[in-house]
Every structure is written in structure tokens, then in C-alpha cells.
């Protein structure tokens, strides 16, 4: 029950996380104009991974996509790539994890197969989350670097007010959405990996049946084969019939010359 709950929760958390990564990638507010110490202006600028926007004080907004691909900064291209890889891996992970869910029965799929699929999707979610966190962090680092470079190039404007030559940009809402979403996807992935351990069958008993000549004779007992401990004895008494065939579970102490292996 706990395994199913962990797996289900991991799936839901990852689903929310990936939805957040998609939302962050599509959002326009990755960087927003820093309004601190800024000349009073009727317009407000903000940029995303795909387009740049200008908003008027009235609320009217005009946006324009980055049409050129080669002219874009390498860092922006890297962030785009990381976010897209995160989304693709996350989407594949979601697809795999749907089939891996313990509460969903698909044909005669064994628990070992479900465990493998759960582990695969968990790893995919972890990598997806890391890609998103890395992408957002690279962009944030770029903003911080540019912010302080702009601050270094200051001059004293009219009225003695210190101004920057360039407009400074600060963290937009998309960065926070991306960080949270990446974190959720990562947590979901870890939960799926934990659930995988509970899904994997820990021991497999192969019941050995031995046949002998006499009904009152003693059966050869190899001991139940255990995946974890090797050969071991089993103390359960389980009588099948009074004839020649007995299970390995039936404890017999004195082997006789009539036993056949």
C-alpha cells in the first residue's frame, strides 16, 4: 500500500513539476526591467526565451519574437536547449510511469517489469528536474553578471542622480516557476526510485518436488531456493498427498536408501 502511495504521489508531483517546466519555458518574464533607481518611464520591458515584450502603463503590450537563430547569445541557446531536454525527458518519463503505476493493470505485466519502468521514469524525472534547474540557474547567473556590469558603468546624470548607461534587468517570475517546477520534478523522480525498491520482488521461492518409491519413506530436502540468502531451510509443513510426492517444505530428518534425487 505504501509503495503504491509513494509511486502515485511521485507521479503526481512529477506531473505538476513538468507542467511547471513547460509553463516557465513558455513564459515571457524571464528577465524584467529593474525599476530601482530608474528614470520614470511610461514603458516596462521584459524578456523570455522566445520573445521580448514592452508594456505600456495603460497595460497595452507589444511583443516580438527572436527571429534570428544565429545572432542569439550562446547562453540563451543553451538555456533553451536545457529546458527543451527537460520537457522531453519529463514527457517520456510521464508516459513510462503511467504504464508503471501499480494501480493500473496492463495485460499480465509482472511486478519486476513495473519496477524497472518505475526506476526508468524516476531517473528521467530526476534528469528532467536537473535540466530545468540548470537552465534557470544559467539564465539567472547571466542576469546577475549583466546587472553588476551595468552597475559598474554608472554615471552621474541630471540633478546629481546616479544612473546606469544600460537598463538593468532582474529575475522574472519564470525563474521562480522554473526553480520550483524543477525541484518538484526532482522530488517526484526520487519518490519513483524509492517506490521502485518496494515494487521489486525481494525473494522468489522455487518449490522443488521430489519423488520416491515408498509412500512411508523420507523425501529428499534440498531446502527452498531463496534469491537473497541462497539455499536455506523452510519450516512450514505442507502435506500435498499421502503418496510419493512431497514438497520441499515438509521437514524430514532421516534420509533413507530408498530416496531418489
Amino acid at each position: 500500500m505504501a509503495v503504491t502511495a509513494c509511486q502515485g504521489l511521485g507521479f503526481v508531483v512529477s506531473l505538476i513539476g513538468i507542467a511547471g517546466i513547460i509553463a516557465a519555458t513558455c513564459m515571457d518574464q524571464w528577465s524584467t526591467q529593474d525599476l530601482y533607481n530608474n528614470p520614470v518611464t511610461a514603458v516596462f520591458n521584459y524578456q523570455g526565451l522566445w520573445r521580448s515584450c514592452v508594456r505600456e502603463s495603460s497595460g497595452f503590450t507589444e511583443c516580438r519574437g527572436y527571429f534570428t537563430l544565429l545572432g542569439l547569445p550562446a547562453m540563451l541557446q543553451a538555456v533553451r536547449a536545457l529546458m527543451i531536454v527537460g520537457i522531453v525527458l519529463g514527457a517520456i518519463g510521464l508516459l513510462v510511469s503511467i504504464f508503471a503505476l501499480k494501480c493500473i493493470r496492463i495485460g499480465s505485466m509482472e511486478d519486476s517489469a513495473k519496477a524497472n519502468m518505475t526506476l526508468t521514469s524516476g531517473i528521467m524525472f530526476i534528469v528532467s528536474g536537473l535540466c530545468a534547474i540548470a537552465g534557470v540557474s544559467v539564465f539567472a547567473n547571466m542576469l546577475v553578471t549583466n546587472f553588476w556590469m551595468s552597475t559598474a558603468n554608472m554615471y552621474t546624470g541630471m540633478g546629481g542622480m546616479v544612473q546606469t548607461v544600460q537598463t538593468r534587468y532582474t529575475f522574472g517570475a519564470a525563474l521562480f516557476v522554473g526553480w520550483v517546477a524543477g525541484g518538484l520534478t526532482l522530488i517526484g523522480g526520487v519518490m519513483m526510485c524509492i517506490a521502485c525498491r518496494g515494487l521489486a520482488p525481494e525473494e522468489t521461492n522455487y518449490k522443488a518436488v521430489s519423488y520416491h518409491a515408498s509412500g512411508h519413506s523420507v523425501a529428499y530436502k534440498p531446502g527452498g531456493f531463496k534469491a537473497s540468502t541462497g539455499f536455506g531451510s523452510n519450516t512450514k509443513n505442507k502435506k500435498i498427498y499421502d503418496g510419493g510426492a512431497r514438497t520441499e517444505d515438509e521437514v524430514q530428518s532421516y534420509p533413507s536408501k530408498h530416496d531418489y534425487v
Epitope: Q33, P39, T41, V43, N45, Q47, S52, V54, E56, F60, E62, R64, Y66, F67, S150, N153, Q163, T164, V165, Q166, T167
Partner: nanobody, 123 residues
Amino acid sequence: QVQLVESGGGLVQPGGSLRLSCAASDSTFSSYIMGWFRQAPGKGLEFVAGITWSGGIKDYADSVKGRFTIARDNSKNTLYLQMNSLRAEDAAVYYCAANAIQLTRRSGDYAYWGQGTLVTVSS
């Protein structure tokens, strides 16, 4: 990269009008935010007006608001500045500038600049 050439400057009396033009060499003119800056003798660069890609949003310096009008014709790759009710303090070299992503009043945000056209206001 876009090349900008200003024209239309000259001598005008106070209260008069003048129309400046800025022709862009690049056919991707519509993908740039455009601005007009001016520099009076012995002073720094001052923002005059700016306009977004399609002309939907315009921004003006307080000193020119209501007197100057910025406009663009993307089919002709040209930016305009209509200057009315000119004053002595409007005399300066007017520069046309372009940048791809932001409409700001800071000269450092503009990547491409014209050579400038001189506007003289004198009686």
C-alpha cells in the same frame, strides 16, 4: 547589421516645425525598436523619443511631450520625428538609434547609431 542615415535637419525659427527622417539599410528594420536621441553642444546624450517594432507603443521625454511625434513606416524602412513648436533649447545634433529587444531611455541599450543631423533653432 543595420545602417542608419538621418536627414531633415536644418535652421528653423522658434515656434517652427521640422521633420527628421532616418532611413535604415536593412530589410529587417521592423525587427528593431527605434529611438531618437539628441546631443546639445557641451552636453551628454539625451533621450527624445522611442517607438516599438510595429509602432504600437511610443515613449517621449517630458521636455518634448505634446510637441514631438515619433512614427515609423516599416514598408519604407524609415523612422520619422515630427518636431513642432521648436524652442531654442531643442537645438542639437539628433541621432537615430536601434536595438532589437527593449524600448528604453538609456543610450547604452542601443546597438546601432546614425551619424546624426544638426537642428538649429534661431531667430
